[in-house]
Interface confidence: low
């Protein structure tokens, strides 16, 4: 339904508060280096303009597209060229090329200072002094660091952020109340950002068909009682929502997401029995709840899949009639029967089925050709099952920190060209799969682990894409979305790698390490471990363990010393010499 003024339409649908928040997120995700005050000024100007259009949709410029209006506004920033360099060239383009240009310049790893959390009293004072500015600052800081964060979900995070301060700044022990809540929001926020980044990568790098296939599989697992037609409808709508958000169309995205939540709740009887509680919540909570809802129970007595997809004489006729629909039905039927499989495994099975039909439906005897297609699935299912079993055993044996270290060594040997901060970040996140998923029973382990690994490996892919240094990473990231994890798992030690020159400075530590949090100290040690492997890729596990144990003892000893700095200087030299000897450097 066409509207005379798109900006007026969205302002009315979303309301002023959400409109302003979403425009701020959009601007901060595009111009990640701009100061907060500049963004607030731009947002206020856009909001005032939107209000004139609400009053009179025929007013001047009210008929322009949102991309045109927002792009024109962004291009008024005076310091565009000195701050962003070639991104300023986007402003010479016309829509839609200009928006595409802005999207291409989004930076997954912007050069921004780490967010340091002030003292609780300082935060509470700032919150009470100007609640609106305080919350806007939160949106701005998250959006600029996470340029693909799912905007309507960020509104939900902001609502929880506000609730935390409202409650805890009145508490007797403000810190005990607030800090755990902020930690939880931070961790959930990072996870949410990474999950959305995979959705956007899927759409942008592999296309709508890839995203729709993922959505069919996931929604069929979640809503196994829903009919195929219902799942297809939800997939179409969900694809639209995510395409919009990934494309920077945040107002349309938030509006359509609200419509989808409304539709789901109005039709929950034909979708899932698990939606009742979600549907009683306010909009932002409702949408979040639906996105996280547990899988419904599988219908009883589902017939064998073989009847329609292997034994039927009409398989090739049905496939030829509407290939993607038939494959969609296969994926739907398989996924609703297998909540115990990861989505990526289900997609691999569907791909195998598709390849088999392509080959067999052109054969002399198609049925004989595809009769054993389900046998081809067995090794595909067993591979992730075995991998998860082995790694969960290793995790249970080592604990999270040492499990992360094992993965650090493993991945540094596979792709040693990748930057040390990226290897540390990605391996630490890969290692978190243990505490996240190994606690689950067998039936929940694979969907938890393999789909989480897909999210983490996508982080590696998007960071590597910015500065490509390894052909092996490029190959695993670009060849097949669903086979990324098996591709990385299959990589052996890179024999072509020339070890890094030894640099004593890399292994020089100071007393400041003693005041770091446990997490920061771990990161320091893990950074040293990656550097060790880059210097000595053929070092054995035992050699690396000995050096790391010595390193931990050295840090502990010097942090207890009276003259810490002298201890780090003197004992550090001894440690470097001993490590070189142990590793034969």
């Amino acid at each position: 339904d066409a509207h005379k003024s798109e900006v007026a339409h969205r302002f009315k649908d979303l309301g002023e508060e959400n409109f302003k928040a979403l425009v701020l997120i959009a601007f901060a995700q595009y111009l990640q280096q701009c100061p907060f005050e500049d963004h607030v000024k731009l947002v206020n100007e856009v909001t005032e303009f939107a209000k004139t259009c609400v009053a009179d949709e025929s007013a001047e410029n009210c008929d322009k597209s949102l991309h045109t209006l927002f792009g024109d506004k962004l291009c008024t920033v005076a310091t565009l060229r000195e701050t962003y360099g070639e991104m300023a060239d986007c402003c010479a383009k016309q829509e839609p090329e200009r928006n595409e240009c802005f999207l291409q310049h989004k930076d997954d790893n912007p050069n921004l200072p780490r967010l340091v959390r002030p003292e609780v009293d300082v935060m509470c004072t700032a919150f009470h002094d100007n609640e609106e500015t305080f919350l806007k600052k939160y949106l701005y800081e998250i959006a600029r660091r996470h340029p693909y964060f799912y905007a309507p979900e960020l509104l939900f995070f902001a609502k929880r952020y506000k609730a935390a301060f409202t409650e805890c700044c009145q508490a007797a022990d403000k810190a005990a109340c607030l800090l755990p809540k902020l930690d939880e929001l931070r961790d959930e926020g990072k996870a949410s950002s990474a999950k959305q980044r995979l959705k956007c990568a899927s759409l942008q790098k592999f296309g709508e068909r890839a995203f729709k296939a993922w959505a069919v599989a996931r929604l069929s697992q979640r809503f196994p009682k829903a009919e195929f037609a219902e799942v297809s409808k939800l997939v179409t709508d969900l694809t639209k929502v995510h395409t919009e958000c990934c494309h920077g169309d945040l107002l349309e995205c938030a509006d359509d997401r609200a419509d989808l939540a409304k539709y789901i709740c109005e039709n929950q009887d034909s979708i899932s029995s698990k939606l009742k509680e979600c549907c009683e919540k306010p909009l932002l909570e409702k949408s979040h709840c639906i996105a996280e809802v547990e899988n419904d129970e599988m219908p009883a007595d589902l017939p064998s899949l073989a009847a329609d997809f292997v034994e039927s004489k009409d398989v090739c006729k049905n496939y030829a009639e509407a290939k993607d629909v038939f494959l969609g039905m296969f994926l739907y039927e398989y996924a609703r029967r297998h909540p115990d499989y990861s989505v990526v495994l289900l997609l691999r099975l569907a791909k195998t089925y598709e390849t088999t039909l392509e080959k067999c439906c052109a054969a002399a005897d198609p049925h004989e050709c595809y009769a054993k297609v389900f046998d081809e699935f067995k090794p595909l299912v067993e591979e992730p099952q075995n991998l998860i079993k082995q790694n969960c055993e290793l995790f249970e044996q080592l604990g999270e920190y040492k499990f992360q270290n094992a993965l650090l060594v493993r991945y540094t040997k596979k792709v040693p060209q990748v930057s040390t901060p990226t290897l540390v970040e990605v391996s630490r996140n890969l290692g978190k799969v243990g505490s996240k998923c190994c606690k689950h029973p067998e039936a929940k382990r694979m969907p938890c682990a393999e789909d989480y690994l897909s999210v983490v490996l996508n982080q590696l892919c998007v960071l590597h894409e910015k500065t490509p240094v390894s052909d092996r990473v490029t190959k695993c990231c670009t060849e097949s979305l669903v086979n990324r994890r098996p591709c990385f798992s299959a990589l052996e030690v890179d024999e072509t790698y020339v070890p890094k020159e030894f640099n004593a400075e890399t292994f020089t530590f100071h007393a400041d390490i003693c005041t770091l949090s446990e997490k920061e100290r771990q990161i320091k040690k893990q950074t040293a471990l990656v550097e060790l492997v880059k210097h000595k890729p053929k070092a054995t596990k035992e050699q690396l363990k000995a050096v790391m144990d010595d390193f931990a003892a050295f840090v502990e000893k010097c942090c207890k010393a009276d003259d810490k700095e002298t201890c780090f200087a003197e004992e550090g030299k001894k440690l470097v010499a001993a490590s070189q000897a142990a590793l034969g450097l």
């Epitope: 195929f228 409808k233 009409d314 009639e321 629909v325």
Partner: nanobody, 123 residues
Framework: QVQLVESGGGLVQAGGSLRLSCTAS????????MGWFRQAPGKEREFVAT????????SYADSVKGRFTVSRDNAKKTVYLQMNRLQPEDTAVYYC?????????????????WGQGTQVTVS
């Protein structure tokens, strides 16, 4: 839900013709396989004809082959059953059915949505 409404039934003499229509409304998301079934008094509901979503594939019960033709107009969300050379044994309540997917569905269990039926009497 998808609602199906049949029309076009009536009383006709043997050898005559009738054209049944079935229109889908409500949440009709393509692709829908459409089928016609019939049920004579005291008998089981039996398959008559089916048509795939694009109309590219048709299937008929042996008893009506060469006499009945199924077709569809997706723009109007309507499926038709043209019945020629009608015989007294064609007397029954005719039901329209729909199912999401593709394929020639010949069994009642394969269909999710059903119309109320329209009476056809051949004298």
């Amino acid at each position: 839900q998808v609602q199906l409404v049949e029309s076009g039934g009536g009383l006709v003499q043997a050898g005559g013709s009738l054209r049944l229509s079935c229109t889908a409304s409500g949440r009709t998301y393509e692709p829908l396989v459409m089928g016609w079934f019939r049920q004579a008094p005291g008998k089981e509901r039996e398959f008559v004809a089916t048509i795939t979503p694009s109309g590219g594939s048709l299937s008929y019960a042996d008893s009506v082959k060469g006499r009945f033709t199924v077709s569809r107009d997706n723009a109007k969300k309507t499926v038709y059953l043209q019945m020629n050379r009608l015989q007294p044994e064609d007397t029954a309540v005719y039901y329209c059915a729909a199912a999401p997917g593709v394929g020639n569905y010949r069994y009642t269990r394969q269909y999710d949505y059903w119309g109320q039926g329209t009476q056809v009497t051949v004298s």
